[in-house]
Interface confidence: medium
Amino acid sequence: GYKAEVMVSQVYSGSLRVLNRHFSQDLTRRESSAFRSETAKAQKMLKELITSTRLGTYYNSSSVYSFGEGPLTCFFWFILQIPEHRRLMLSPEVVQALLVEELLSTVNSSAAVPYRAEYEVDPEGLVILEASVKDIAALNSTLGCYRYSYVGQGQVLRLKGPDHLASSCLWHLQGPKDLMLKLRLEWTLAECRDRLAMYDVAGPLEKRLITSVYGCSRQEPVVEVLASGAIMAVVWKKGLHSYYDPFVLSVQPVVFQACEVNLTLDNRLDSQGVLSTPYFPSYYSPQTHCSWHLTVPSLDYGLALWFDAYALRRQKYDLPCTQGQWTIQNRRLCGLRILQPYAERIPVVATAGITINFTSQISLTGPGVRVHYGLYNQSDPCPGEFLCSVNGLCVPACDGVKDCPNGLDERNCVCRATFQCKEDSTCISLPKVCDGQPDCLNGSDEEQCQEGVPCGTFTFQCEDRSCVKKPNPQCDGRPDCRDGSDEEHCDCGLQGPSSRIVGGAVSSEGEWPWQASLQVRGRHICGGALIADRWVITAAHCFQEDSMASTVLWTVFLGKVWQNSRWPGEVSFKVSRLLLHPYHEEDSHDYDVALLQLDHPVVRSAAVRPVCLPARSHFFEPGLHCWITGWGALREGGPISNALQKVDVQLIPQDLCSEVYRYQVTPRMLCAGYRKGKKDACQGDSGGPLVCKALSGRWFLAGLVSWGLGCGRPNYFGVYTRITGVISWIQQVVT
């Protein structure tokens, strides 16, 4: 019998260029008579053009929704009702070819062609893209608040904020033909629920979405997005009602930046330079293609690429890479944004060099990618350390902390977190090394204590990059480095003269002069520690709630002991900058550290002094007794304390703590407390210091109060941010 053919709606979006008309500002106002008149003519022309081709039998509807420069560009969509079996045959490319063919066939024709009655359409300026019914609905929902803007070369155009009576607005942006548009979004409120989506075309086509951002992101307070060409659309969807624009948008045309380079590396190890996508840190554009060719001076070396918060992974099958595609020596890899450092190590087998290609495979892009490149010794990639094959990083070996996700850095250790005697491979505790007392059979623990040694897990690296054998030599009153750098920056970690309350838990004035109280509207929220004249360190999770993210809310008190009263040694500061660790992850508490820059430098006194920061190699031995201080609750669920409390806690081996917390303890965490519980940090202590006293009498910052199960519960220790695990970031910021 006869079977009705199934028809489907195929939606197309596009633009065409009219050579005999000019754009005017009237055409940006949808309510103007010029706009209504021009759309009527343009609609008619579009319909006639389509119906002049074999697509005519499938024509369903069409609409011209906007105009732009060039001399006049019309932006439109149309729907064809086509038999299902022909759907794939009528791709946007095929439809565009049919329409262009029609236009070309009448260019020199003297015959009357309906669609050419008023418009001279440029065949080369026709663009047809795939769209969907959903895209058209999204477009229509913005037409009540539709803004077209043309931005000329050398201009930076600040866009007018959205109409708050509308629920959605669209900015249609256009620039000069051979340039690309760069959009800058700056969030101006601490919290909002607004949503912004950027498209690589004139309208909100889902398949051409570059990126979407949501809700006054603190992780990215400023976002710069590149289009692949001179057209872009930005769609705003209203969040909470607000009389203030929660963001500022500005746009500028920029020239295409070539992303090709030929480099020859020097005969030295470590980082030698940086490769990045165009206009880094802007998001890379949807049609980015970078090709970097690096020549290595000798086959002794391999090439290392060090990424920041970005990793390369093998992609299963031929699925597209959603966060950038890489080809390195014909190996296809996909980029993946992660909250960790990562290195890709490329063995070199031929002197021809290495070509690295980066491509954005889909229109969806992401933050610009930057990679540091350098050489490593292929026979010894990590001198004195362990090469973690999971992430390509060199990590300390046998220090009692599983730095590598697979834990191999702590396997097959002859001596874990101890010193290995040369004579018989027995293990002695680290504080016994270079202490003037031979503990190994033939005294190998006391050899080479006055000279440079190869760098390793527990050696201290001097400023001149040489290493010394003595563990924890910083600020012990005796220069161990040739350049004396182990005794620099030592105006720290000394307690003020204090009349201690013997056996008590209440601290006295000047006892912990680095202790900070971080307050909002006169209420103590978190602890912190002074580490430099203008910097206080605390926990990132103190700023977890959007309402706590603004610097203007916070006041930092130093030299404080009592919450309900002030004394002469106390000083307060406003916060000029708040920096959370870029890898901080709220759910896992990893990298739970933040830095506050004070609005003016501290004046040091007996009551206000910084604590000493440990070197990355500083070893805080499990079993060591250290101290935590804070105004936190005195019992689980209780109110905060009026007096600054102090309590001694014991450092716990990482493996045991990891077991207790079911392997949620990362290498950036350190545990302290007691198996019986009782002594612990609690709510309100967050961000406060865990300090350990060195033999020199100076106090070093070992940790920051981070998390734990309850307070003082048996079998559950307090978990602290391990300062040695984040020290390189701290130093990078503070210096």
Partner: antibody, heavy 124, light 110 residues
Framework: EVQLVESGGGLIQAGRSLRLSCAAS????????IYWVRQIPGKGLEWISS????????AYADSVKGRFTISRDNAKNALYLQMNSLRAEDTALYYC?????????????????WGQGTTVTVSS | QSALTQPPSASGSPGQSVTLSCTGT?????????VSWYLQHPGKAPKLMIY???KRPSGVPDRFSGSKSANTASLTVSGLQAEDEADYYC??????????FGGGTKVTVL
Amino acid sequence: EVQLVESGGGLIQAGRSLRLSCAASGFTFDEHVIYWVRQIPGKGLEWISSISWKSDIIAYADSVKGRFTISRDNAKNALYLQMNSLRAEDTALYYCAREKDGDFYYYYFAMDVWGQGTTVTVSS
Amino acid sequence: QSALTQPPSASGSPGQSVTLSCTGTSSDVGYYNYVSWYLQHPGKAPKLMIYEVSKRPSGVPDRFSGSKSANTASLTVSGLQAEDEADYYCSSYAGSNKVVFGGGTKVTVL
């Protein structure tokens, strides 16, 4: 004097059950992890179970898991081992031992006080 | 969990030193610094001699010393005396709150 005294051993048929007790004195019982360790006559020591002071962490050797149950009553300063489905290979001298005392509450996994043991003989 | 490996016997003359070995795996002796040594005289309960690889409980003479290298722990008894004749057992923490013992070494003072 710090002391641990085991009791409850005896001759028992295979497949049956037996309950061992360990009475503690001379120290703060509820501040210590307590272990059961057994020794087959003329053979070595075998750890079989341990229990934390609050009974919230309990562990068993694979050889007894599912058959033996450790428990404690801090009010009575007593430790127990309920042994079900006994086998001939469970024949041994059963010791209870406390974890090493320390100045601070820390992990040691070492036993500094032992009882004299109670003998369990399982006949097949 | 399998037992740690100890040599069945060792001997030495009075005044001499004897070193006992205890071999485990990278998951127990090799991984944790929780190796203990016990001495047991016939018919008596074991006595703790060393904990945490090399620490001596109070009352244990300093003739007894412990050390560790890779997956092997050692107990050295120097200045051997007649009363040191006994069975010696090592133990190690093996993760997940479990403890594993060695098979024991019989020390004879010649």
